[in-house]
């Protein structure tokens, strides 16, 4: 509603713009005929302070001048940067019901002059780009500030553009619309830049710089690849540029990668050969171009190709391992397994393996070809047989990787002695030994070989081994390992023709078992009494068992229980005791010991011997 | 424990065709690798087929291209399919299920079902 401005008018002296820390004074006037009608000596002027729209101050103590009825006069101070509003209102006092009435209001602003721009930095993008210039501006004015961006060069060439700061914008880029042609290439361009407001100017050092200086190139477009022949390794790298481009910069990676190969190339013409790519590999390639070997900038890397390189026939060898049963009088069941090649070695998708079994002496060979890590097949158990098995993919098969298939645990002599196991951490086992003390032929390695003490199908759940060379005597083995499962372990010495081995059985971690055993049945022979039992359930044993313990007591007794300790065997389900008294009434009950402790105790079976037992 | 029954034995003439099944039961959540042997009088026990998890199979020599071993995981059974029977091929059949733990190989057999092959 001081829009109008009907009843009086506003003024500010020095002016409604401001530096800050300065005073201003703010008059207020009623027009001839305006006031508070009857009684003119009742006006009275009052004037308001707004910032952003909320009253903050009534200025009644700052009158500095008083025209009864008139006019006021009041002086402000401490005014913050920024704008301040201030409304004269005539308060008719004789009027106790009517509120203040607006007579007319000023906006005041505060702010400083600008600073000199600094920091001008000019860019052209590409030939037939325009140039376009930034700087720093400075403090903020808090006031409408107008900057003039004025380029000069050659032949009288003169250019500027124009743009303001203000509360809602800002300033510091501008696009003169002209374009600098590389037949400039030599010459030299000032640029300067003139920040204008209320309270003052400034002016920045004139910026000198030539074409080469401020033209950046345009990122290289239209990025392809051909590999050559269906290489995998080898590739034209092809791109679309600017004319005048002279060097550029490729950078590729394999996409799980973290670090760049950076090449330069000269002169390319949009076109450069690779030949240390990685094949069947997903590649990410970027290029960047400059107009200067010397002077001039990098354009911005263009956008990324992503392609994977060609297939190659697989390198490097499978590593094999086999596990061999007797299934009947004359027959022996062998089973290979192998690891797969990691993607450097297979290079491409592995299509099936080759598998070749063959009788040495007789020449008796069993091909056969599978998608699976493991083969299986039933052979004589006469003759000395060899396995090979190589890797096929689309463009050809590894080389075959070949195995004797002996008795792997057949020679004492060569197995290897102290075989310990020691728990790393939760999922890794030390395992180490020392070397045969009298084998009759050379170590060619060791194989380091595990398998969870779980029931598992023997083509479902493979063995897991590790190579290890003849002069090495520890493995750390952790493929596959899980706390709180025993697994049987074993280490095989093996020469060209023989084998031997040791075994121990080991945890990563371990807890007391959940339970004891179950006492099934307990029988009276011979004077002594045995004890049958079914094992604890193997997610109940919570580790490697080291061996159980049978309790027994007289019944109703309140001294301590005996105990005999046996040493754990999987195989063994019994064992007998003599030192019970004939026709005394005795509880029994059965306990499981792992390196972490004993298990709560199993059942409790009762049973009173009969005959004569010692 | 694991409990294996054969079923489908006969006397049959040269040159039929016979069908043996075996189910499994019990703890059997293990046994992928399942057998057939045959023993005949007064010979010792041979192995004639077997079939691995990913159903691989393997056979005797003298049997191969007449037997054919398969398996119904659903149903928890293996069969073997006689064909083109011969009176050599006169054996009690056994079904045999192998599982592993750790190293020790644990082997669980049926009772056998009389196969008599007349000339």
């Known amino acids: 509603n001081i829009d109008v401005c009907k009843l009086g008018t506003v003024t500010v002296q020095p002016a409604p713009v401001i530096p800050l820390g300065s005073a201003a004074n703010i008059s207020c006037s009623l027009n001839p005929k305006q006031g508070c009608s009857h009684y003119p000596s009742s006006n009275e002027l009052i004037l308001l302070k707004f910032v952003n729209d909320v009253l903050v101050e009534n200025l009644h103590g700052k009158k500095v001048h008083d025209h009864t009825g008139h006019s006021s006069t009041f002086q402000v101070t401490n005014l913050s940067l920024g704008m301040t509003l201030f409304v004269c209102k005539l308060n008719c006092s004789n009027s106790q019901k009517k509120p203040p009435v607006p007579v007319c209001g000023v906006e005041i602003s505060v702010g400083v002059a600008p600073e000199p721009p600094q920091n001008i930095s000019c860019v052209q993008e590409g030939e037939n780009g325009t140039v376009a210039c930034s700087w720093n501006s400075g403090k903020v004015t808090y006031l409408k500030t107008n900057y003039t961006l004025q380029l000069s060069g050659p032949n009288n060439l003169t250019c500027q553009k124009q743009c303001f700061s203000d509360n809602r914008q800002n300033c510091n880029r501008l696009d003169l619309g002209i374009n600098l042609s590389p037949d400039l290439a030599e010459s030299r361009f000032i640029v300067r830049v003139t920040a204008i407001n209320d309270l003052g100017n400034s002016s920045s050092l004139p910026h000198t710089f030539t074409f080469l200086d401020i033209v950046i190139p345009l990122p290289p477009w239209d990025i392809r690849i051909n590999f050559l022949n269906a290489s995998g390794s080898r590739g034209t790298l092809q791109w679309e540029d600017e004319g005048q481009v002279v060097l550029n910069q490729l950078r590729y990676q394999p996409l799980n990668s973290t670090s760049w190969n950076m090449v330069n190339a000269t002169n390319a013409k949009g076109k450069y050969d690779l030949r240390d790519l990685r094949p069947f590999t997903e590649y990410e390639f970027q290029i960047s171009s400059k107009l200067h070997l010397s002077g001039g900038s990098w354009s911005n890397w263009s956008e990324s190709l992503r392609t994977r390189t060609p297939e190659e026939e697989p390198v490097g060898i499978l590593d094999i391992w086999y596990m061999k049963q007797d299934i009947d009088y004359d027959r022996q069941q062998i089973s290979l397994f192998w690891k797969s090649l990691n993607p450097s070695e297979a290079r491409g998708k592995i299509l099936h393996y080759q598998v070749t079994l063959q009788e040495v002496t007789k020449k008796t060979t069993l091909q056969n070809t599978t998608r699976h890590t493991s083969w299986t097949r039933v052979i004589p158990r006469t003759g000395a047989w060899t396995a090979s098995v190589s890797a096929a993919n689309s463009k050809g098969a590894s080389a075959p990787t070949h195995i004797n298939i002996v008795d792997l645990c057949g020679t004492g002599l060569l197995a290897p002695h102290q075989v310990s196991a020691k728990s790393e951490n939760m999922d890794n086992i030390l395992v180490t030994w020392q070397p045969p003390k009298k084998a009759d032929s050379a170590v060619r390695e060791y194989i380091v070989e595990w398998r969870a003490l779980q029931p598992g199908s023997i083509t479902k759940f493979p063995p897991h081994w590790l190579r290890i060379p003849p002069d090495n005597m520890s493995a750390l083995i952790s493929e596959n390992i899980k706390p709180y499962i025993c697994y049987e372990i074993r280490v095989h010495a093996l020469s060209e023709s023989q084998g031997g081995c040791s075994s121990i059985r080991g945890d990563s971690k371990h807890k007391a078992p959940v339970s004891g055993p179950h006492i099934t049945a307990i029988t009276e022979k011979k004077e002594r009494l045995f004890i049958s039992w079914t094992h604890i359930p193997f997610p109940e044993q919570r580790g490697c068992i080291l061996h159980y313990r049978i309790y027994w007591k007289e019944r109703d007794s309140t001294a301590q229980p005996e105990l005999c300790e046996i040493q754990y065997r999987r195989s063994q389900n019994s064992h007998p005791i003599s030192s019970l008294q004939p026709r005394v009434t005795y509880v029994l009950w059965m306990t499981a010991v792992t390196a972490a402790g004993e298990s709560p105790q199993g059942n409790e079976r009762e049973f009173c011997p009969q005959g004569k037992a010692n | 424990q694991v409990q294996l029954q054969e079923s489908g034995g006969g006397l049959v003439q040269a040159g039929e065709s016979l069908r043996l099944s075996c189910t499994a039961s019990g703890s059997i959540f293990a046994i992928d690798d399942m057998y057939w042997y045959r023993q005949a009088p007064g010979k010792q026990r041979e192995f004639v087929a077997y079939?691995?998890?990913?159903?691989?199979?393997n056979y005797l020599d003298s049997v191969n291209g007449r037997f054919t071993i398969s398996r119904d995981n659903a149903k928890n059974s293996v069969y073997l399919q006689m064909n083109s029977l011969k009176p050599e091929d006169t054996a009690v059949y056994y079904c045999?299920?192998?599982?592993?733990?750790?190293?020790?190989?644990?082997?669980?057999w049926g009772q056998g079902t009389q196969v008599t092959v007349s000339s």
């Open positions: 045999n299920a192998k599982q592993i733990v750790g190293f020790q190989i644990d082997e669980y």
């Open positions: 079939i691995t998890a990913t159903n691989s199979a």
